[in-house]
Amino acid sequence: ECVTRLFKDIHFEGGDIATVFTPSAKHCQVVCTHHPRCLLFTFTGESASEDPTQWFTCVLKDSVTETLPRVNRTGAISGYSFKQCSHQISACNKDIYVDLDMKGINYNSSLAKSAQECQERCTDDIHCHFFTYATRQFPSLEHRNICLLKHTQTGTPTGIMKLDKVVTGFSLKSCALSNLACIRDVFPNTVFADSNIDSVMAPDAFVCRRICTHHPGCLFFTFFSQEWPKESQRNLCLLKTSESGLPSTRIKKSKALSGFSLQSCRHSIPVFCHSSFYHDTDFLGEELDIVAVKGHEACQKLCTNAVRCQFFTYAPAQASCNEGKGKCYLKLSSNGSPTKILRGTGGISGYTLRLCKMDNECTTKIKPRIVGGTASVRGEWPWQVTLHTTSPTQRHLCGGSIIGNQWILTAAHCFYGVESPKILRVYIGILNQSEIKEDTSFFGVQEIIIHDQYKMAESGYDIALLKLETTVNYTDSQRPICLPSKGDRNVIYTDCWVTGWGYRKLRDKIQNTLQKAKIPLVTNDECQKRYRGHKITHKMICAGYREGGKDACKGDSGGPLSCKHNEVWHLVGITSWGEGCAQRERPGVYTNVLEYVDWILEKTQA
C-alpha cells in the first residue's frame, strides 16, 4: 500500500540498514525510495536531539513485514518509501537549504554571483553532487560569495551542520539541466584501467551502464562479458572514476565492453528499468519466496508486485507437470544486483519492473512503427495531441505533444487571435478526428505560456506551453515524449518523423486520420540556402526531401518532429513554418526544442 504522508514526532523502531544525512525529511524519503532495500525511514530534525552530530540523520530501514513498531519521539519524522506507490518518482531536488552546510569533499572553490549560479556550476561539473554557497552576509570577508563544490562516495553528505549566512543544495543533473556531454557509445573489446569505486554483477553491458548511471560516484564502467576468459570475472560490472572525469587508459581486450555514465541525460534513457529477460540464466541472491506460476512474464509480474523483490529466476516446468507451471524464485540482495550470474542452467531471469516508475515515462518502449503507408495506427504516436478551438465553431487548430502529465508543448503561432484558454480543448489518445463527438472527454487549458520573445513564426521563438486543468493518466495510447538532452547536442538523428492531421497539399482540408511521414533532417547551412530571405537561426531545425513531396502542412503546426535515438523517442522539433508545403528545395522549418529545454523546464518546474 502507498503511504506518502510523513509521521511527525514518530520514530520507527529497528530495521536499520543504513544511515545517511539529508537536509529534510522529504529528501530522506527520496533517498529511501532510491535505495535498493529501504522501505521505511526515520529522519531526525534539529529539535530531536541535543547532539548536533545527530541532526539531519536519515535512517533507512527494511522490514520483512513492510512495517515497524512506532515510538513517540519529539522532532523525529518517519515515513515510507515511494517504492509501494505507482506515481512517478524523481531524484531531482531543486530546493535550496538556508543556514545549512552539507559536508563532503570540498574540491573546488570559486566566486559566484548567486546561489543559483553556484548550483548551475555544480550541475555542470562532472564530479559535483552538492554545493554550499556563502552569501554576501557571511562573516568572513574572503569567503563571501564563495561557491564550494562537493562530492562524496555515496552522493549524500557525510554530515550536515548549521552555519549562518550560507545556503546549500544539490546538483541538478537528475533534473535534466546539465550541459555536460553524454557519450552514449559502448566500446567493444575495451577495458578502462582507472580505479574501481564498486563492482556488481550484471547480465549485460547495458544493465552495467544503467547501474553506473544510477551510482553517484560512477563516471564510466567496464563490463566483462560471459565469454571473458577469467571465469571469476564473468558478468562483472566495474564502476569507475578518475580525477579528469575521463578514462586515463584504454586497453584493447576482447570480450570486455566499456562505456560512460549517462548521468547528464538520464531523464531521456531508462536508468532503473531493466525490462529484458535473460534466457538460460540464473540470478543468485537471497530468496524471498518460491511460487508456482505459468511463464516467466508471470514471474516478473509477481516480482514487480512484491515490494522487496529485486530480481527473479524462473525455472520452466518439466514437460507437462504441475499444469505447465514452473517455479518462480523471487530474490533480493544488499545492492539490488544478483550476487552471482550462472549461465546454461535453463532458467529465465530478469528484474522487477517496480523501478520503471523512477525513470521518466517518456523512455517507455512503445509499439513498433508501422512501415509503409502514411496513415498512423492507434498508439503509434502516443504523445501527439489535437488542439481544438471552440470559437466560433469547434475545429482542429494545431497539433501538440505531451511532455508531462499536465503539459503540452506546441507552437506559439497557433494562438494568434486566441483571447482566452477557455476556448481551447486538448484531445489525447485520438487517431481519427471523427472520434471527437460532443461527449468525448477532453482536457481544458488552464494557462497558455508563449515565449516572451515570440513575434512571428519566421523569426523564431515559435514555442508555447499549455498547462492542462487536470493531469493526464498515462496509458499505451497516451504518454509523453522525451525532450532532447542538452548532453546530446552532437547527436545526428537519422530516424525522424513528422505527424499531424494537417493538409496533404497546400489547398486541402484537415485529415481525419493522423498522418505520418519520415523526413530527413537538413543542416542549417543547407536550409539557409533555401530560404535566402529569412534568417535560419540555431534555434530552428529544418527537415525535408530535396525533391519535396513529403512535409508538414497547414494544421500540422505545433505538432512534433519526433526522432528515435537509442530506442527512445525525442521531441526534436515543433512544426513551425515553411514556404508552401512539400515544395522542391523548400524544407519545413521547425522550432529546435533542444535550444528551449531550459525555458521548458523553468516554466514547467516553477
Partner: antibody
Framework: EVQLVQSGAEVKKPGASVKVSCKAS????????MHWVRQAPGQGLEWMGI????????SYAQKFQGRVTMTRDTSTSTVYMELSSLRSEDTAVYYC?????????????????WGQGTTVTVSS | EIVMTQSPATLSVSPGERATLSCRAS??????LAWYQQKPGQAPRLLIY???TRATGIPARFSGSGSGTEFTLTISSLQSEDFAVYYC?????????FGGGTKVEIK
C-alpha cells in the same frame, strides 16, 4: 614546512614597472588566497590587494587600481604582483601573505604565513 | 574605507609587566579583527584572529578581546622577545586596513 619565498630586491627608475614573485610550498597552492601588503620605510602596513589562485580572481585597493596587476601560475605555485608607473613613494618592502583557506567555510582568519619581503627602491 | 586607530603609539613597559594595547575601528567590524607582531627587519607574524582566537604556536600570555569597534590585545607578562611593533587589522570590508601600530618598548 609551509613557506613563501619572494624574489630579490629591485631598484627601478620612476615610470618603470616592477614584477615581484612569491613562490608557495608546503601546502595546496590553489586552496588559499594570497594578499600583497607593503611597508614604506619607517611606516605601517598597507594592504594592496588579493588574488584567488584557484580561479585567478583579484580585488585591489582603490589606491592601486589601474597600476597593480596580480597573477598566478598554478604549475609553479607562484603568484606575481606587478606595479607600474613607479614613483619614489612606491619605495617599500613588498610582502606576500597567505590568506583564508578557501575550501572550508569558517568565520575568522588572518594572514598566517608571510614571505620574507622584497625591497623595491624607486630612484632616478 | 574603515579607519583603524591604535593607541598608544608607543608603550613603555618593564619585562614581566602587563601590556594593554587598544585598537578602535571607525565602524563596526564585528569580530573580524587580527593582531600581528613585527620585529625590525622581519615580516609580520599573526598572533590573534577573530578578535580573540590565538594563532597556532602563539603563547597563552597573548590574548585578544572586544567586538564591534573597540578591541584590546593584552600581553599578560612581557618577555624580552615581545618587544616589537603590534598592528591590528580589520577583515570585515574591502579594502583591508591596518592600524598605525603600537610600539612596545622596554621601560
Amino acid at each position: 614546512e609551509v613557506q613563501l619565498v619572494q624574489s630579490g630586491a629591485e631598484v627601478k627608475k620612476p615610470g618603470a614597472s616592477v614584477k615581484v614573485s612569491c613562490k608557495a610550498s608546503g601546502y595546496t597552492f590553489t586552496s588559499y588566497s594570497m594578499h600583497w601588503v607593503r611597508q614604506a620605510p619607517g611606516q605601517g602596513l598597507e594592504w594592496m590587494g588579493i588574488i584567488n589562485p584557484s580561479g585567478g580572481s583579484t580585488s585591489y585597493a582603490q589606491k592601486f587600481q589601474g597600476r597593480v596587476t596580480m597573477t598566478r601560475d598554478t604549475s609553479t605555485s607562484t603568484v606575481y604582483m606587478e606595479l607600474s608607473s613607479l614613483r619614489s613613494e612606491d619605495t617599500a618592502v613588498y610582502y606576500c601573505a597567505r590568506g583564508a583557506y578557501l575550501l572550508e567555510l569558517y568565520y575568522y582568519y588572518g594572514m598566517d604565513v608571510w614571505g620574507q619581503g622584497t625591497t623595491v627602491t624607486v630612484s632616478s | 574605507e574603515i579607519v583603524m586607530t591604535q593607541s598608544p603609539a608607543t608603550l613603555s613597559v618593564s619585562p614581566g609587566e602587563r601590556a594593554t594595547l587598544s585598537c578602535r575601528a571607525s565602524q563596526s567590524v564585528s569580530s573580524n579583527l587580527a593582531w600581528y607582531q613585527q620585529k625590525p627587519g622581519q615580516a609580520p607574524r599573526l598572533l590573534i584572529y577573530g578578535a580573540s582566537t590565538r594563532a597556532t604556536g602563539i603563547p597563552a600570555r597573548f590574548s585578544g578581546s572586544g567586538s564591534g569597534t573597540e578591541f584590546t590585545l593584552t600581553i599578560s607578562s612581557l618577555q624580552s622577545e615581545d618587544f616589537a611593533v603590534y598592528y591590528c587589522q580589520q577583515f570585515n570590508d574591502w579594502p583591508l586596513t591596518f592600524g598605525g601600530g603600537t610600539k612596545v618598548e622596554i621601560k
